[in-house]
């Protein structure tokens, strides 16, 4: 794979991957009551990270804020920040890596600095699918947690703090803001990777040129102002072609501003 | 407004079978549920079930399963309840209702009576 | 199924008087997720479809005289006319509205002096 589509796919997945991981921090649907040997009721209830809500068979949904910071267990407040810093980084990421992108040119940056920047937008891209993923899978075990603890008959209040009635304990399983969660991480990591991936197909290496020799011979030494271009052509009018680039280039690259290493 | 119009009296034989209908007007049909209830001469209310007009979706009770058959036709705004195997202890108005807020039931039809009588 | 139990079975009072009824679930009607009561009170004159008076054990359908007003809590609830009228003769039902099959208590039915 040439590293302009590694880059590129690896650009195209982290923001399918950072797109989730909004989607899911939004989402109302991190846990759902299980209704797998429950009594029936005509109630579902469901909680994401911001509110909790209720549906009612008639159809009307009820949705209520969690107007409270100190009052949270301090676990959702970890999931919460978790997932915000998989957000920050992930904007970030991708601010980077629009102007790290192979395929748009900016200025006279050169193409040691956009390995840089793709370099760091896939360090941030990883970061930031770890962050959601370690998120989303706090706050699965602390459900799985609470679901081994609730029992039928406990006295419970709101999700099981506070209230002095004995109800039926609602319990709670994963929802499906976990799986986005958990599939959105997912991909942003491996968006990260990938940039990573590229990153290191654009850098070159100078050990890749010790072992080229090039043969000025009058039918491949071209004049050019600005200085002599060697061709490792026999006979024939091709660029050379950068050894780090791994295949054929587009004709954007050719037309691309020339760098140190165009020059023998 | 909200109206729901049930079907007339029926006067049935023990073993047969009746239909009964009701219509809703003034709101999306299909976007409710709507109940049956039970109620036999001068006694309580019995939920008998519910269906979805919007994709067919039933509960009932799992005392009529069986007895009860819920239906809804989505462009004639109208729910039906077939009864079967009809027997004296079938006799009872029979209600429609739309279930409303807090899954209680807002708006009743006025009630269909069926007598079972050979 | 649930048992919805309600007392007593029939009240006779003269116009103007307070009346309360009471009603029992056998199991907790109150959902921890909006800490609401799925308890509805109905009221059926004869030769009419029962009228729905107050849902969530407290909120009074609209329309409906504020004299009516429903209290209660988890398991007990209880229904309230404050001052009754002459229009007030009916048979009152309480429905538990939370757990599949719905269940209906046998009534209070109120009469009037």
């Known amino acids: 794979m040439s590293v302009t589509a590694c880059q590129g796919l690896g650009f195209v997945v982290s923001l399918i991957g950072f797109a989730g991981i909004i989607a899911a921090t939004c989402m109302d649907q991190w846990s759902t009551q299980d209704l797998y040997n429950n009594p029936v009721t005509a109630v579902f209830n469901y909680q994401g990270l911001w509110r909790s809500c209720v549906r009612e068979s008639s159809g009307f949904t009820e949705c209520r804020g969690y107007f409270t910071l100190l009052g949270l267990p301090a676990m959702l407040q970890a999931v919460r920040a978790l997932m915000i810093v998989g957000i920050v980084l992930g904007v970030i990421g991708i601010l980077v890596s629009i102007f790290a992108l192979k395929c748009i040119r900016i200025g006279s940056m050169d193409d040691s600095a956009k390995a840089k920047m793709t370099l760091t937008s896939g360090i941030l891209f990883i970061i930031s699918g770890i962050s959601a993923i370690i998120g989303v899978s706090v706050f699965a075990n602390m459900l799985v947690t609470n679901f081994w603890m609730s029992t039928a008959n406990m006295y419970s209040g709101m999700g099981g703090m506070g209230g002095m009635v004995q109800t039926v304990q609602t319990r709670y399983t994963f929802g499906a803001a976990l799986f986005v969660g958990w599939v959105a991480g997912g991909l942003t990591l491996i968006g990260g990777v990938m940039m990573c991936i590229a990153c290191r197909g654009l850098t070159p290496d100078d050990s890749n040129f010790k072992a080229v020799s090039y043969h000025a011979s009058g039918q491949n030494v071209a004049y050019r102002p600005g200085g002599f271009k060697a061709s490792t052509g026999f006979g024939s009018n091709t660029r050379n072609k950068k050894i780090y680039d791994g295949g054929a280039r587009t004709e954007d690259d050719e037309q691309s501003h020339p760098t140190k290493y165009d020059y023998v | 407004q909200v109206q729901m119009k049930e079907s007339g009296a029926e006067l049935v034989k023990p073993g047969a079978s009746v239909k009964i209908s009701c219509k809703a007007s003034?709101?999306?049909?299909?976007?409710?549920?709507m109940d049956w209830v039970k109620q036999r001469p001068g006694k309580g209310l019995e939920w008998i079930g519910q269906i979805y007009p919007g994709n067919g979706d039933t509960n009932y009770n799992g005392k009529f399963k069986g007895k009860a058959t819920l239906t809804a036709d989505k462009s004639s705004s109208t729910a039906d309840m077939q009864l079967s195997s009809l027997t004296s202890e079938d006799s009872a108005v029979y209600f429609c209702a739309r279930l409303g807020y807090g899954n209680s039931f807002t708006y009743w039809g006025q009630g269909t009576l069926v007598t079972v009588s050979a | 199924d649930i048992q919805v139990t309600q007392s007593p079975s029939s009240l006779t009072v003269t116009a103007g008087e307070k009346v309360t009824m009471s009603c029992k679930s056998s199991?907790?009607?109150?959902?921890?997720?909006?800490?609401?009561?799925?308890l509805t009170w109905y009221q059926q004159k004869p030769g009419q479809p029962p009228k729905l008076l107050i849902y969530w054990a407290s909120t009074r359908e609209s329309g409906v005289p504020d004299r009516f007003t429903g209290s209660g809590f988890g398991t007990d609830f209880t229904l309230t006319i404050s001052s009754v009228q002459a229009e007030d003769l009916a048979v009152y039902y309480c429905?538990?509205?939370?757990?599949?099959?719905?269940?209906f208590g046998s009534g209070t039915k109120l009469e009037i002096k």
């Open positions: 003034g709101y999306a049909f299909s976007t409710y549920w």
């Open positions: 429905q538990n509205a939370y757990f599949y099959p719905f269940t």
């Open positions: 199991q907790s009607l109150l959902n921890s997720g909006n800490q609401k009561n799925y």
